[in-house]
């Protein structure tokens, strides 16, 4: 894992650590929006697409992901921030499908990323939503050290 | 570098259950999807299902629903595959496997034989 | 569940050959398809996801294309590594989903 200086904990990041033994995330302002029921979405349909995906700075090597989606019972969002340069391997986060905005903090400072998400509904991916943003370049809003863990990026070596 | 490791070959009798087990080191283990496919001998590729430890819900092949139970413990980075009321046509290689973030399986388990006769 | 049918199902080729296999799916998947190639006793390994994207360490030669229903995997130069089996497999199922039938590349 890495460390990542200037994340507090929030309520996001306690559940992840209660119940998920992957503390990497944290809520954004406007998060934990609810999905209320279904629409009867089925597979053979076109998925409801996630829309206004916006990637803004927190802190110096942060990202904050604010999404809007369709009011239904939305399984997961499936997240995956890749340096643009694909210098290094992806990152990828699951998070729960209530939620709408996610931190994402450990990231290089000074470093433009491309983020791309999609949700689950009834077992069918939704068409992915991609956007792009930098992290600070400096040091600011340092607060307390936070271990952060991520799980191995997709695109590297392969053993069969 | 994910490694899986899955457990060894079984011979079952027909009507009875196996458990396969797929072990995974390198990475979180929890954030990332696991997968199950089988092959029997001379035959193509078939998706059982899948799982993603962190939240421990499953999804099935219409195929197998019923038939097929996936479970994972995230204290050992295990994931399971269990298959019950087996016949001999469930005779085949299964495989695990971890899916990157657009599904594509990039990493996959030995295979374990699991032979099912009388 | 999506069906998905490859053709053709044998494709005899000579070295140096371009090769190309078709995926059809039975509704529309965007473009979450991936390829394999498998050789016998061994686990099968990812070629191309997401239609079009080469896994790392696959070489130039594999290419992907097509998106909702049509897709294409195109060897542009057969080698001797290349007879193998492929496998087309849709992944707008979550986790992952049906494979096709598979395609047979053997030696004209």
């Known amino acids: 894992g890495s460390t990542a200086i200037g994340m507090k904990e929030t309520a996001a990041a306690k559940f992840e650590r209660q119940h998920m033994d992957s503390p990497d995330l944290g809520t954004g302002g406007g998060s934990g929006i609810e999905g209320r029921g279904s629409m009867g979405y089925r597979g053979s349909e076109q998925a409801p697409e996630l829309e206004n995906l916006t990637v803004t700075e927190v802190g110096w090597d942060g990202l904050r992901l604010n999404w809007t989606a369709a009011d239904q019972a939305y399984e997961h969002f499936i997240i995956q921030v890749q340096e643009a340069n694909k210098v290094e391997a992806a990152r990828n986060l699951t998070v729960p499908g209530s939620l709408r905005a996610v931190d994402i903090p450990g990231l290089k400072a000074a470093t433009p990323y491309t983020v791309s998400i999609y949700g689950v509904i009834q077992g069918y991916r939704t068409p992915v939503l991609s956007a792009e943003a930098s992290t600070a370049s400096g040091l600011n809003d340092i607060f307390e050290a936070q271990k952060i863990e991520w799980h191995e990026g997709t695109h590297h070596h392969h053993h069969h | 570098q994910v490694q899986l490791v899955q457990s060894g070959a079984e011979v079952k009798k027909p009507g009875s259950s196996v458990k396969v087990s797929c072990k995974a080191s390198?990475?979180?283990?929890?954030?990332?999807?696991i997968s199950w496919v089988r092959q029997a001998p001379g035959q193509g590729l078939e998706w059982m299902g899948g799982?993603?430890?962190?939240?421990?819900?499953?999804n099935y092949a219409q195929k197998f629903q019923g038939r097929v139970t996936i479970t994972a413990d995230k204290s050992t980075s295990t994931a399971y595959m269990e298959l019950s009321s087996l016949r001999s046509e469930d005779t085949a290689v299964y495989y695990c496997?971890?899916?990157?973030?657009?599904?594509?399986?990039?990493?996959w388990g030995q295979g374990t034989t699991v032979t099912v006769s009388s | 569940d999506i069906q998905m049918t490859q053709s053709p199902s044998t494709l005899s080729a000579s070295v140096g050959d371009r090769v190309t296999i078709t995926c059809r799916a039975s509704?529309?998947?965007?473009?979450?398809l991936a390829w394999y190639q498998q050789k016998p006793g061994k686990a099968p390994k990812l070629l191309i996801y997401?239609?079009?994207s080469l896994e790392s360490g696959v070489p130039s030669r594999f290419s992907g294309s097509g998106s909702g229903t049509e897709f294409t995997l195109t060897i542009s130069s057969l080698q001797p590594d290349d007879f193998a089996t492929y496998y087309c497999q849709q992944n707008k199922k979550f986790p992952s989903g049906t494979f096709g039938q598979g395609t047979k590349v053997e030696i004209k």
């Open positions: 997401d239609a079009s």
């Open positions: 509704q529309s998947i965007s473009s979450w």
């Open positions: 799982i993603i430890p962190i939240f421990g819900t499953a």
């Open positions: 496997a971890k899916g990157n973030f657009y599904g594509g399986l990039d990493y």
């Open positions: 390198g990475g979180t283990f929890s954030s990332y999807a």
